[in-house]
């Protein structure tokens, strides 16, 4: 029968009595960055070349007897859920191996930098196919670690890390809070985030998705037939760089940022109960399980958009937040979030020749989050249209002016402290989609693209007594680049994206009487791209 | 994820750059800056990395840990540089008392040092 | 599905001695912990011993140190109980179980994680009677 | 050796009670603690692992809690399937030890 972990990351139409996706990743190499490995298990025997390198701090304690078994334990599972012939995700993956860990599973940063620069200076001397760098290990957050994993990732190297074990934010670890890395935190056969002793997963912005990493079986270092359960999100990473030399050996061409796109567009949704996190971290933890694409070709015509949610801003009154999106993906909108509802909107702006999108707290604010809506969006040409605060009543317009551009984002961001308090909602006139509108007193911008064949629309969800949550989703075969609330509503805490859906949070309804003040009107924009439709039908 | 400005502590210690009269006297207005793990049991005193900006060649890496070494000799530390880094980040690893910190981050072309810590297989 | 079947049960006298194999199907047999445990007619549950995935660790409950050996072949997924020196009080139905359990890694100590005996098989019948 | 004392011996209830039994160590097993159930002539089946989680598969009206010394198990509403004996189980080291079980009769 098939181990749990694999029927769970593997789509229905590749479940048979054995696991034998196609092309299991031989295209591609696996760097492993772990403790010693026993590379002559029958599970990895063949697959994994171990290299000369090693840098490992001596054990703790007088009395430590090393033991190969042990010293071996970590490494020599994970290459075996990587690529092991029985129990692997990726079955032709080929794999190498560094040694940064001593036999208690303990290393440096130090060591860890010194191991990517061997990877960096291997990949110069022999270039060969896509590479994936799996680093299961984790520690304090790290500047230099972080920037390090950064160089490595735009050199084109994937690298796939563990969120870490301390059922924590994932953002005070490193390299788990490096932006560029792809981070894993672990769920179980019940789909539940992983307790691990007294701990657990790791979870939070920082975390990229889920995947198995607990009773994970895979070769045991205890003899060259042995097999053992482990836990971890180790294991967790482990899956996902399998998945990732899969994808990788299915379209060698494709960049990191494409790479983790399809990472979250195959997994499944919404399946964590997200209960096991707490409270202010589940808005900010991705529900996303990592799972093989239905097919290797094809996902290539979709338009790929996902959330990236920034740090904190802090409760200071000029506080700000600023979400990125990574160096190849378009920046589609900007919204914020504040869980006191005290906040003053949000921009998009041009820093470093990038659009950023960046939150403001209000006076009195415990702090506010911005949220960019990062897409992947070839030849795309996008600007921001900015409208001052308006002297009419009717309220701030802006639309997309120029020839064959679409509206894929709205913001609106206030200098005011109490905008909208005591206002009458502004409604958008039918018929006029291809604008942003917002109260007088705010300045609206209007996120305008043109790439080939995109094009866009609004979808609005309005309830009219008070609810918590407003959602609007988009139909199959458009993805959603924008979501905002329709402003009016004063009690509005914020919107955001998740997966294909617009959710705008209100305050708690018991706190806001059932007025007209209590309406709430989710938009989302929902695009999609003909051009990547067509070309995808060509390629095929 | 993470911004890089973020949760972790930061010590930023000011240049004099009178001090010790370098002839690559750091660019004026520019601060160095000091990191080291929060997590205090994870820390490894005494093992520094030396980041350098970016665009530094080897050669001035490897005259910067020079000239560490012998201005640490002029106040009476033993200093070794355990590594060169070159290829995804130019810099070095050193190990030396955390009393010459403030020398090391008036070096030219510093632009942090991180204290070495500890990680972990997950 | 992991299935575990038990043989070997059967009626012996005291002193003597007999085998018990357990059966396993998968991979995953190797993966665990394995432990036997005895049920003697109209009594409740007692662990009888256990021993590790690579049968590098085993250990046993005081009444039968010494005269039980439990063993396992990784090649054939079968665990064994050898039972010598056989006395009336170990009359019972002997099942073999599987300890589910996993190791794990926080902060520089390897871990187990134990959850239970999660698979049992059907039980054999030892009768030590003259 | 951890001695494992189970209360009472014997539970006589009805379908839709609460029901609570008691387990106690003779020493700290912090919450190495399973609970099984066992039908007569069938094998024991794994209900409840390190004293408050719940197996796969197992219904929600089954839970665990405690720590130490003192755990129970509660079946928030019996249903007629619930009528069997149950166990708890120490694993506090690899040696492990039972209690001496708990049957649950209709009233």
């Known amino acids: 029968s098939i181990p749990w972990n694999l029927e769970r990351i593997t789509p229905p139409r590749y479940r048979a009595d054995e696991y034998q996706p196609p092309d299991g990743g031989s295209l591609v190499e696996v760097y492993l960055l772990d403790t010693s490995i026993q590379s002559d298990h029958r599970e990895i025997e063949g697959r994994v070349m171990v290299t000369d390198f090693e840098n490992v701090p001596e054990e703790d304690g007088t009395r430590f007897h090393r033991q190969a078994s042990k010293c071996d334990s970590h490494g020599t599972h994970l290459a075996g859920v990587v690529s092991g012939r029985d129990a692997g995700v990726a079955k032709g993956a080929s794999m190498r191996s560094l040694r940064v860990l001593n036999c208690q599973g303990k290393g440096t940063v130090s060591g860890t930098l010194i191991g990517l620069e061997f990877i960096r200076k291997s990949q110069l001397v022999q270039p060969v196919g896509p590479l994936v760098v799996l680093l299961p290990l984790a520690g304090g957050y790290s500047r230099v670690l972080n920037a390090a994993c950064q160089r490595l990732a735009r050199a084109g190297v994937v690298l796939v890390t563990a969120a870490g074990n301390f059922r924590d934010d994932a953002c005070l670890y490193s390299p788990a809070s490096a932006p560029e890395v792809i981070t894993v935190g672990a769920t179980n056969a019940q789909d539940q985030p992983v307790t691990l002793g007294t701990l657990g997963t790791n979870f939070g912005r920082c975390v990229d998705l889920f995947a198995p990493g607990e009773d994970i079986i895979g070769a045991s270092s205890d003899c060259s037939t042995c097999f053992v359960s482990q836990s971890g999100t180790s294991q967790a990473a482990a899956h996902v760089a399998g998945i990732a030399a899969m994808m990788l050996s299915a379209e060698p061409e494709l960049t990191l940022a494409e790479l983790r796109q399809r990472l979250i567009h195959f997994s499944a949704k919404d399946v964590i109960n997200e209960a096991w996190f707490p409270e202010d971290q589940r808005v900010l933890t991705p529900n996303l399980v990592a799972a093989l694409p239905p097919s290797t070709h094809g996902a290539g015509w979709q338009l790929f958009c996902r959330t990236v949610w920034s740090a904190h801003s802090g409760p200071t009154r000029m506080a700000t937040a600023v979400a990125r999106c990574a160096p190849d993906e378009e920046l589609l909108s900007c919204s914020s979030f504040s869980r006191s509802g005290k906040r003053r909107g949000e921009r998009m702006e041009a820093q470093g020749g990038k659009l950023v999108c960046r939150a403001h707290n209000a006076f009195g604010g415990e702090g506010v989050y911005a949220i960019a809506r990062c897409c992947l969006l070839p030849q795309a040409n996008c600007s921001v249209h900015t409208a001052p605060p308006a002297e009419a009543s009717m309220g701030t317009r802006v639309h997309c002016h120029q020839q064959g551009h679409v509206l894929t984002g709205c913001s609106s961001h206030w200098e005011v402290e109490d905008l909208g308090t005591h206002k009458p909602p502004v409604l958008r006139p039918r018929g006029q989609p291809n604008q942003c509108v917002g109260h007088r007193e705010a300045s609206i911008h209007a996120s305008c693209c043109h790439a080939p064949g995109l094009e866009c629309k609004v979808k609005e969800h309005g309830i009219p007594a008070p609810q918590e949550q407003v959602t609007v989703a988009c139909e199959e075969g458009w993805t959603l680049t924008g979501c905002s609330a329709l402003p009016g509503t004063s009690h509005v805490l914020g919107a955001y994206a998740v997966d294909n859906t617009c959710v705008v949070r209100s305050r708690d309804v018991s706190t806001t009487g059932s007025t007209s003040e209590g309406a709430v009107t989710a938009v989302a924009i929902c695009c999609r791209s003909r051009h990547l439709a067509q070309a995808s039908q060509e390629l095929q | 994820q993470e911004d890089e400005d973020g949760d972790y502590e930061e010590l930023v210690l000011a240049l004099r750059s009178e001090e010790d009269g370098l002839a690559e006297a750091p660019e004026h207005g520019t601060t160095a800056t000091f990191h080291r793990c929060a997590k205090d049991p994870w820390r490894l005193p005494g093992t520094y990395v030396v980041v350098l900006k970016e665009e530094t060649h080897l050669s001035q890496s490897e005259r910067t840990a020079r000239r560490l070494q012998a201005q640490a000799a002029r106040r009476g530390y033993l200093t070794k540089i355990l590594h060169v880094f070159h290829g995804l980040l130019p810099g070095f690893l050193v190990k030396m008392s955390g009393d010459l910190l403030e020398l090391a981050l008036k070096l030219p072309h510093v632009d942090y040092i991180e204290e070495d810590s500890s990680v972990f297989a997950q | 599905e992991v299935q575990l079947v038990e043989s070997g049960g059967g009626l012996v006298q005291p002193g003597g001695s007999l085998r018990l194999s357990c059966a396993a199907s998968g991979i995953t047999f190797s993966s665990y912990w394995m432990s036997w445990v005895r049920q003697a007619p109209g009594k409740g549950l007692e662990w009888v011993a256990n021993?590790?995935?690579?049968?590098?660790?085993?250990y046993y409950v005081d009444s039968v140190k010494g005269r039980f050996t439990i063993s396992r072949d990784i090649a054939k997924n079968s665990l064994y109980l050898q039972m010598n020196s056989l006395r009336a009080e170990d009359t019972a139905v002997y099942y073999c179980a599987r300890d589910r359990g996993t190791y794990y890694f926080q902060s520089g100590s390897y871990n187990y994680y134990y959850y239970g005996m999660d698979v049992w098989g059907q039980g054999t019948t030892v009768t030590v009677s003259s | 050796d951890i001695q494992m004392t189970q209360s009472p011996s014997t539970l006589s209830a009805s379908v839709g009670d609460r029901v609570t039994i008691t387990c106690r160590a003779s020493q700290s097993i912090s919450s190495w603690l399973a609970w099984y159930q066992q039908k007569p002539g069938k094998a024991p089946k794994l209900l409840i692992y390190?004293?408050?989680s719940l197996e796969s598969g197992v219904p929600s009206r089954f839970s665990g809690s405690g720590s130490g010394t003192e755990f129970t198990l509660t079946i928030s509403s019996l249903q007629p399937d619930d009528f069997a004996t149950y166990y708890c189980q120490q694993y506090n080291s690899y040696s492990y030890t039972f209690g001496q079980g708990t049957k649950l009769e209709i009233k």
């Open positions: 021993i590790k995935q690579d049968g590098s660790e085993k």
């Open positions: 390190k004293a408050s």
